[in-house]
Each structure stands twice: as structure tokens, then as C-alpha cells.
Interface confidence: medium
């Protein structure tokens, strides 16, 4: 997270960590005792190591009461996912055993009604994803609030020009945004998971390329079909 | 199939004012700003400014700012310019396009005479 | 604002043969931004060249774009007939976007 500041520990307990080989890889969201959503490029970047989920936790590095890691039963990426393309950028990540809630842990509800969140709406983004341009790295937890970009903008030529489809949405990025580390994150707006930071090598914090993040709303079928 | 539909020639006396409409289909209006140019015979294209569908909000080049109007109708799915205090420095073909010019419209040929 | 200027305005061209068309910008354009089209007459312009090198859809391979900086160029590796059209240079590095005033391709 570019340009945030050190989240309340443990106000986001749907929060996860994807982890390889014990490693921060991206962000992902609690959506169901045993599911966790995140972004399907994340798994690419895992080669054959092995996947984790942790959950509960606000720092990486530091023990918590509330911290475990859940190994990883079976990955679900989107069906119309593609290594060249942001489109479809979601993975559903199935947990070995319910995880055990608590008010560290807790499944986030998202939306389901397809419609796309008012433009200028400020929505919460948290990841321990890269800090810097230099890319430092957080042990805890970031968060930044952005304001949804409508997408024509975010489409213009000198944005993502044309890139971004009905099942994505922007959020603004001049100087803060969601970076390296962040991808699979949820993107929150009035208490619902309304997006999930895609995992595309974008280049952060510049204000003429918005933040990409896909629409959970536009994947309900999807989603539901997985979970059931 | 992206269509951008512009309406016929108009003729037009100095002075005067004319709105020319643009109606899109084959796509998401709101998904894309609506660009408008201006091609004078043997001259250059020039960039008249866009609209954001969404809000309405434009972006005009400098030397067109009092003389174009950009508005739209996002029930109809159209855009609209307005040219006003017409002179014959504004007989041209005006274009309409979107996706930043991945489309056209085929253009409104706008001839200013007395 | 940036102007684009388009070298030769009229060039007049045997089919087989290689056409080279440039596009000289006052000052610097990202590579990003500089786009060509194709018109023909009584047609409005189409998207032929993105990005500087980015053939758009439906655009035969004999066409490439390539360029940095100030300097921009169209080539096709063997003029064909249906290639005899109007090409215009458009950048939008910069506002306001700006248009060149076309090379007009002529068949021998």
C-alpha cells in the first residue's frame, strides 16, 4: 500500500495472507469459513511452492494469539483466467478445515447486487503489499482509503485506455494506491467487499494509471457455484 | 459492433447556432468519454474536447472553448455538440468518436453560407 | 500544444514497393501515445497503428510503426492498392491531442 498508514490491528479480520513457502505472496479476503478469495495470478507466481493461508494476523513476523496458518486444499481459479490478461483475475482458495472465528477472524460479506459503486465513493484497501517505490516491504498491516474512478476515465487513453470492462472497477491512485504485495486484497466500500486488487504489474501511485480491481459482484454466479 | 450514428449535413446561416447529435450503441455509453473532432477541407484534424458520459464533465481544447458545447443524454445514449455564432471558419466535417478514437462516427458535414 | 508534422504530404507509390512515412513532433511524445489512421475519402478515419508499433485488429502485417522521442514512422514492407489512403500521425501525450496533416499515399 502506497501512501497509507499502519491499519488497527485486527479491525480486518477478514483479512488473509496468501503465503508460499512462508512468505507473503499477495493478499486474499475471508469470504466463508473455509474460503478465501484472492487474485488467480498470484498462483502463478507460486511455481510448485508450497500455498498458505494466514489468517488473524497483523503482523507477519510477530506472534499473536489469534494468528494460524491454514494449509491449502484446493485452488480454484477462475475458469477464464489467462496468464496475459487481468480479466477474471479471481481464485478461490479452499482451507484444509473451517477456520476458527473469532473477533480476529471473520468472513466479509460481499456484494452481490451487480451494480457498479458510485464514482467518488471512498473505499478501504489493506495489503502488506510494497511500501515504497524502493520496495520496502511492511511487517503489519496497511490500509489506505481511495475514491471509486468512474470508468470512462480510467479508460481514456492515457489511463488504462480501454482495458477496463463492466467487471472491473478503478479506484484513483496519486500517490496512494494498493501495489506489489497487495494483489487478491479486498477492496471494501461501506462494509462489503466490493473488489479484489488484480495482480497485473502496474505501475503504482501514478494518477494516470488508476488502481484495477475486480468486481466480485460481476463473479456472484461463480463464486456461489465454488462455495456450494 | 460499435456504432456511432451522426445526422445528416446541415446549412446553416452566420451567426446561428447547430447542435449536432451523435447516438451510440454496440457498447456501455457511460464506459467511454465521447471525443469530438473538426476536419476543415485540406486542413489538419482538430481535437474539439471530450465528455465523461458519467458526470457530464469536459475537457475542451483552448481554441474551441466558447465556440463548442459538449453535452449528454445517457437515456438516449447520445452525445450532442453545439456550435454557436457560426462563421464560414467553421464549414467543416465534425467527427464524433469514442474508446478514444477506436470509433468514429462518419461525420456531420457543417457548411456555414448566407 | 505539440505539433505534428507529417513528411512527404503526397507521395505517389508502385504496388510491391516500400513505403516509409514519417511523423516529427515539436516536442517529445511518450511512444505510448502516439497513434496512426487510415482515411479514405468520403470515409471517416480508422484506428490503423496504437501505440506506436500496435497493428489495431483487421490491419495486414505488411504495415509497422516504430519511433521514439520526436521521431515516428509508418512502413509497409510491400505497397498493396487497397493501402492508397490518406494516413494521419495523432498523439495524445499531451493536451490538447493533436493531429498531423496526413501523408496522402498515392498508387503509381
Known amino acids: 500500500i502506497l501512501g497509507g498508514r499502519e491499519a488497527e490491528a485486527h479491525a480486518r479480520p477478514y483479512m488473509a495472507s496468501v503465503q508460499v513457502n512462508g512468505e507473503h505472496l499477495c493478499g486474499g479476503v475471508l469470504v466463508a469459513e473455509q474460503w478465501v478469495l484472492s487474485a488467480a495470478h498470484c498462483l502463478e507466481d507460486a511455481a510448485d511452492g508450497k500455498v498458505q493461508v494466514l489468517l488473524g494476523a497483523h503482523s507477519l513476523s510477530q506472534p499473536e494469539p489469534s494468528k494460524r496458518l491454514y494449509d491449502v486444499l484446493r485452488a480454484v481459479p477462475h475458469p477464464d483466467s489467462r496468464p496475459d490478461t487481468i480479466d477474471h483475475d479471481l481464485l478461490l482458495l479452499q482451507l484444509s478445515e473451517k477456520a476458527t472465528l473469532g473477533p480476529a477472524v471473520r468472513p466479509l460479506p460481499w456484494q452481490r447486487v451487480d451494480r457498479d459503486v458510485e464514482p467518488g465513493t471512498l473505499c478501504d484497501v489493506a495489503g502488506w503489499g510494497i511500501v515504497s517505490h524502493a520496495g520496502r516491504r511492511p511487517d503489519r498491516l496497511q490500509h489506505v482509503l481511495l475514491p471509486v474512478l468512474d470508468r470512462a476515465t480510467c479508460n481514456r487513453r492515457t489511463h488504462h485506455d480501454g482495458a477496463i470492462t463492466q467487471r472491473m472497477m478503478c479506484a484513483e491512485s496519486n500517490r496512494r494506491d494498493s501495489c506489489k504485495g497487495d494483489s487478491g486484497g479486498p477492496l471494501v466500500c461501506g462494509g462489503v467487499l466490493e473488489g479484489v486488487v488484480t495482480s497485473g504489474s502496474r505501475v503504482c501511485g501514478n494518477r494516470k494509471k488508476p488502481g484495477i480491481y475486480t468486481r466480485v459482484a460481476s463473479y456472484a454466479a461463480w463464486i456461489d457455484s465454488v462455495l456450494a | 459492433e460499435v456504432l456511432l450514428q451522426q445526422s445528416g449535413p446541415e446549412l446553416v446561416k452566420p451567426g446561428a447556432s447547430v447542435k449536432i447529435p451523435c447516438k451510440a450503441s454496440?457498447?456501455?455509453?457511460?464506459?467511454?468519454?465521447m471525443d469530438w473532432v473538426k476536419q476543415s477541407h485540406g486542413k489538419s484534424l482538430e481535437w474539439i474536447g471530450h465528455i465523461n458520459p458519467n458526470n457530464g464533465g469536459t475537457i475542451y481544447n483552448q481554441k474551441f472553448k466558447g465556440k463548442a458545447t459538449l453535452t449528454v443524454d445517457k437515456s438516449s445514449s447520445t452525445a450532442y455538440m453545439e456550435l454557436r455564432s457560426l462563421t464560414s471558419e467553421d464549414t467543416a466535417v465534425y467527427y464524433c468518436?469514442?474508446?478514444?478514437?477506436?470509433?468514429w462516427g462518419h461525420g456531420t458535414l457543417v457548411t456555414v453560407s448566407a | 500544444q505539440i505539433v505534428l508534422t507529417q513528411s512527404p504530404a503526397i507521395m505517389s507509390v508502385s504496388p510491391g514497393e516500400k513505403v516509409t512515412l514519417t511523423c516529427s513532433a515539436s516536442?517529445?511524445?511518450?511512444?505510448?501515445?502516439l497513434y496512426w489512421y487510415q482515411k479514405k475519402p468520403g470515409s471517416s478515419p480508422k484506428l490503423w497503428i496504437y501505440?506506436?508499433?500496435n497493428l489495431a485488429s483487421g490491419v495486414p502485417a505488411r504495415f509497422s510503426g516504430s519511433g521514439s522521442g520526436t521521431s515516428y514512422s509508418l512502413t509497409i514492407s510491400s505497397m498493396e492498392a487497397e493501402d492508397a489512403a490518406s494516413y494521419f500521425c495523432?498523439?495524445?501525450?499531451?493536451?490538447?491531442?493533436?493531429f498531423g496533416a496526413g501523408t496522402k499515399l498515392e498508387l503509381k
Open positions: 495523432h498523439q495524445w501525450s499531451s493536451y490538447p491531442p493533436t
Open positions: 454496440g457498447y456501455t455509453f457511460t464506459d467511454y468519454d
Open positions: 468518436g469514442t474508446g478514444d478514437f477506436a470509433y
Open positions: 501505440s506506436t508499433s
Open positions: 516536442s517529445s511524445v511518450s511512444s505510448s501515445y
